[in-house]
């Protein structure tokens, strides 16, 4: 259930309605729920999250990370350099999030969840940004042949590389959350 | 959820040092972010510092910047608020919160499970 329907909201009409900033960090923790759904399904079929050959999977990936210079962190903050960091992370992982999308058997749904519910959220964040200028938008082509790649990579890999997409994923978030939540 | 306890609190004259310990019961620690607050007679609770589930992102209120020192053993199930420079100011019962979230942050509402207390008392 998507955040705001579910039936606390309904059995409370008088409550007040969610500000910008609570109906994102509900959105990010609805977002994290899938993803721990997610990685339950992606640990009990592999042993990957317990694998240390992480690196050589790691080589074909880019993920977004948080590092000081991008204002998110509490030495150097900065409120609009860290939320351009956000968006633009979030823009860079839907590649990823689609990639994941023919990877889960039981938890197809939570997949596709977790992707839809990020377009989500990308919007949210858009509307509090004040210089949207800065926010580079992937490259569609690029985006298309790293698919590619990723899809045609072998078994072993390909389940890394699901595992590593849903903790990078989680990691980013968790960092964006904390970030959002001095804004 | 899990179990908190804190430890370490006590008597300690203004300039002094404390170490503050927080053990956690449960094999989820180290995906849990972790918070010091603290509540002095007649005054709320408030934020202390904060520490993510592998300590790269850690965050002080502005009273304790540069004095306290935040950290977590994930080994261990502990985290830890070394506390220098005391004031009397910094007299304060001291909880500590857990997020099983794992993002933390300075209001209470961010956390789900809580400590009992340490007592801290800094004498001038």
């Known amino acids: 259930v998507p955040p705001g329907e579910d039936s606390k909201d309904v059995a409370a009409p008088h409550r007040q309605p969610l500000t910008s900033s609570e109906r994102i960090d509900k959105q990010i923790r609805y977002i994290l729920d899938g993803i721990s759904a997610l990685r339950k399904e992606t640990c009990n079929k592999s042993n990957m999250c317990e694998s240390s050959k992480e690196a050589l999977a790691e080589n074909n990936l880019n993920l977004p990370k948080m590092a000081e210079k991008d204002g998110c962190f509490q030495s150097g903050f900065n409120e609009e350099t860290c939320l351009v960091k956000i968006i633009t992370g979030l823009l860079e992982f839907e590649v990823y999030l689609e990639y994941l999308q023919n990877r889960f058997e039981s938890s197809e749904e939570q997949a596709r969840a977790v992707q839809m519910s990020t377009k989500v959220l990308i919007q949210f964040l858009q509307k509090k940004a004040k210089n949207l200028d800065a926010i580079t938008t992937p490259d569609p082509t690029t985006n298309a042949s790293l698919l590619t790649k990723l899809q045609a990579q072998n078994q072993w890999l390909q389940d890394m590389t699901t595992h590593l997409i849903l903790r990078s994923f989680k990691e980013f978030l968790q960092s964006s959350l904390r970030a959002l939540r001095q804004m | 959820q899990v179990q908190l306890v804190e430890s370490g609190g006590g008597l300690v004259q203004a300039g002094g040092s404390l170490r503050l310990s927080c053990t956690v019961s449960g094999r989820t620690f180290s995906t849990y972010a972790m918070g010091w607050f603290r509540q002095a007679p007649g005054k709320e609770r408030e934020f202390v510092a904060d520490i993510n589930w592998n300590s790269d992102n850690i965050w002080y209120a502005d009273s304790v910047k540069g004095r306290f020192t935040i950290s977590r053993d994930n080994a261990k199930n502990v985290m830890y608020l070394q506390m220098n420079s005391l004031k009397p100011e910094d007299t304060a019962v001291y909880y500590c919160?857990?997020?099983?979230?794992?993002?933390?942050?300075?209001?209470?509402?961010?956390?789900?499970?809580w400590g009992q207390g340490t007592q801290v008392t800094v004498s001038s």
């Open positions: 919160a857990a997020d099983s979230y794992g993002v933390g942050g300075g209001k209470e509402e961010y956390y789900d499970s």
